[in-house]
């Protein structure tokens, strides 16, 4: 389905709003560093120039790729060796390897200082004054700090965005109406983010075989009653869509997103019955919807699985006839009658039965030699199982930050060379499993938790692969993206790690203690553990936690003093002292 | 795709030989058991022999032990199997197949024990 202008085609299907916007991510996070004011400029340029495309799709320059427009517009930014150094070099390529070279130096840390929100009234005046730029601003400042955020699900977003405003700078009370929304945006929108990024790693790293069985499990998970051959056409057209996305060509993902959305509407009887109300909603929200969808429920009448995939004399003839197309149909067949496993043990169950077919079938008695293939698999079962009865045990007795607590012990002790606010930061979302999975019923807490863990530690991943110091973390990271979570989680104390010299500076503390919110409390004294961990391997849990109780008297102390600073000053040797004689 | 083509059959007396050959291709193989598979007319499927993907390992029926020898040539991605001292109850259609399968994936070569 060619054309002779790619721009024209893209504009005319998505129409100029979301062509727009799409573009602003689109430039956002490749310049991650660059003004708003200049992207704007770079938007509406290529919006003027995608517009005489329409008018006359053979006029100069409209035949190009969207890359080596976008590209080329990218490459006239004044600012771009002094800003970006290295990534200029980008520009001196010719268009595949010029886009490679872009994607390559997205950045998924970049240096920009946290988003501060302003009071209300002065939000809503901006927001009255220009909507259009207010939600561009939006739109810039998500995008830059998420790189590989899904770009059609950000412009969602930012729907809401505007809704929560419209709703609540007319209310009475403009705060408690907008507070609230504005925390749900932000928390959906960076796990919207981290499970955006696991994708992409997922297919950068790993390829589509990869992206392309996970599809397959969870979308027979969500969709039993379809056949396989209707989940492998959603399976093919998905990961065209993430691979476009993740590859930095947002319009062509967005349009066939929209595409996949129109399809599974209008083919919901051999999808599912609960696509019905995602259906009627407009474009951005029922995409949304659909991919939040609920699983059906199982048919009930599915036979065992032994009959076609053990006790089967035609198990090798039909895997060597098809290997992909007969695994498939085995993680098919297996995650439709599993709601209750998460994606990554579905995976890794038919690893597992790929490797025992590849040695028996080589057999002379290949059906001898896998008869017993599903007793191999509740070992790989129970290890999911008693991770989370486990954890949320702990979580129970703990709470969240104690929880938070014990997983930075556990992780820093694992791999203590990790950057301390690497550390701090995935250890505060892994501890975060607790509250999101462990109040579910049985059957959806693996789900829930493994599938959760394993998006937390693409981040770890992610973070360590721009600065590698650990072998152990490169080693969890990239053998095996199904393995990644079992990895970590059989990552024992690091014995070969030197323990940090005590830095006295790292645990003085101000009277600015005092004015921080709960939040940035608990990440200042989790901060202060991953280093006393640094410092001490092997403390035990309870001289950690004795130290820890001090530190949190030594600072309420301090903050209900009359003259704080000099509580500080006074107290904080104190403290550092009876630590390092309590860890000795 | 997975294509086994049988050959070598014909027309022989009691206790005469005869070599089969199977061509395979569309499959990896040296990767993969093969084995002998026979039918009488009217009756079911039979199990001749078995050979695994090296060639190592090799199991026959009782009915052919001693008699026939079961091989393979993985660099020709060829299966063979030798039968000597042929007796009027070998007379079947035989058939190559994958792993342990027992279903007929190709037309198979005509074996007539017959004075």
């Known amino acids: 389905d060619t054309h002779k202008s790619e721009v024209a085609h893209r504009f005319k299907d998505l129409g100029e709003e979301h062509f727009k916007g799409l573009v602003l991510v689109a430039f956002s996070q490749y310049l991650q560093q660059c003004p708003f004011e200049e992207h704007v400029k770079l938007v509406n340029e290529v919006t003027e120039f995608a517009k005489t495309c329409v008018a006359d799709e053979s006029a100069e320059n409209c035949d190009k790729s969207l890359h080596t427009l976008f590209g080329d517009k990218l490459c006239t930014v004044a600012t771009l060796r002094e800003t970006y150094g290295e990534m200029a070099d980008c520009c001196a390529k010719q268009e595949p390897e010029r886009n490679e070279c872009f994607l390559q130096h997205k950045d998924d840390n970049p240096n920009l200082p946290p988003l501060v929100r302003p009071e209300v009234d002065v939000m809503c005046t901006a927001f009255h004054d220009n909507e259009a730029t207010f939600l561009k601003k939006y739109l810039y400042e998500v995008a830059r700090r998420h790189p590989y955020f899904y770009a059609p699900e950000l412009l969602f977003f930012a729907a809401r965005y505007k809704a929560a405003f419209a709703e609540c700078c007319q209310a009475a009370d403009k705060a408690a109406c907008l507070l609230p929304k504005l925390d749900e945006l932000r928390d959906e929108g960076k796990a919207s983010s981290a499970k955006q990024r696991l994708k992409c790693a997922s297919l950068q790293k790993f390829g589509d075989r990869a992206f392309k069985a996970w599809a397959v499990a969870r979308l027979s998970q969500k969709f039993p009653k379809a056949e396989f051959a209707e989940v492998s056409k959603l399976v093919t057209d998905l990961t065209k869509v993430h691979t476009e996305c993740c590859h930095g060509d947002l319009l062509e993902c967005a349009d066939d997103r929209a595409d996949l959305a129109k399809y599974m509407c209008e083919n919901q009887d051999s999808i599912s019955s609960k696509l019905k109300e995602c259906c009627d909603k407009p474009l951005l929200e029922k995409s949304h919807c659909l991919a939040e969808v609920e699983n059906d429920e199982m048919p009930a009448d599915l036979p065992s699985l032994a009959a076609d995939y053990v006790e089967s004399k035609d198990v090798c003839k039909n895997y060597a006839e098809a290997k992909d197309v007969f695994l498939g149909m085995f993680l098919y067949e297996y995650a439709r009658r599993h709601p209750d496993y998460s994606v990554m043990l579905l995976l890794r169950l038919a690893k597992a039965y790929e490797a025992t077919l590849e040695k028996c079938c080589a057999a002379a008695d290949p059906h001898e030699c896998y008869a017993k293939v599903f007793d191999e698999f509740q070992p790989l079962v129970e290890e999911p199982q008693n991770l989370v009865k486990q954890n949320c045990e702990l979580f129970e007795q703990l709470g969240e930050y104690k929880f938070q607590n014990a997983l930075l012990v556990r992780y820093t002790k694992k791999v203590p060379q990790v950057s301390t606010p690497t550390l701090v930061e995935v250890s505060r979302n892994l501890g975060k499993v607790g509250a999101k999975c462990c109040k579910l019923p049985e059957a959806k807490r693996m789900p829930c938790a493994e599938d959760y863990l394993s998006v937390v530690l693409n981040r770890l991943c992610v973070l360590h692969e721009k600065t590698p110091v650990s072998e152990k973390v490169t080693k969890c990271c990239t053998e095996s993206l199904v393995n990644r979570r079992p990895c970590f989680s059989a990552l024992e104390l690091d014995e070969a790690y030197v323990p940090k010299a005590f830095n006295a500076e790292t645990f003085t503390f101000h009277a600015d203690m005092c004015t921080l919110s709960e939040k940035e409390k608990q990440v200042k004294k989790q901060t202060a553990l991953v280093e006393l961990v640094k410092h001490k391997p092997k403390a035990t849990k309870e001289q950690l936690k004795g130290v820890m109780d001090n530190f949190a008297a030594f600072v309420e102390k301090c903050c209900k003093a009359d003259d704080k600073e000099a509580c500080f000053a006074e107290e904080g040797p104190k403290f550092v002292a009876a630590s390092q004689a309590a860890l000795a | 795709q997975v294509q086994l083509v049988e050959s070598g059959g014909g027309l022989v007396q009691p206790g005469g030989s005869l070599r089969l050959s199977c061509a395979a291709s569309g499959f990896t193989f040296g990767s993969f058991g093969m084995s002998w598979v026979r039918q009488a007319p009217g009756k079911g499927p039979e199990w001749v022999s078995a050979?695994?993907?090296?060639?190592?390992?090799?199991r026959y029926a009782e009915s052919v032990k001693g008699r026939f020898t079961i091989s393979r040539d993985n660099a020709k991605k060829t299966l063979y199997l030798q039968m000597n001292s042929l007796k009027p109850e070998d007379t079947a259609v035989y058939y190559c197949?994958?792993?342990?399968?027992?279903?007929?994936g190709s037309q198979g070569t005509q074996v007539t024990v017959s004075s």
């Open positions: 197949t994958i792993g342990g399968s027992t279903s007929r």
């Open positions: 050979i695994d993907g090296g060639g190592a390992d090799t």
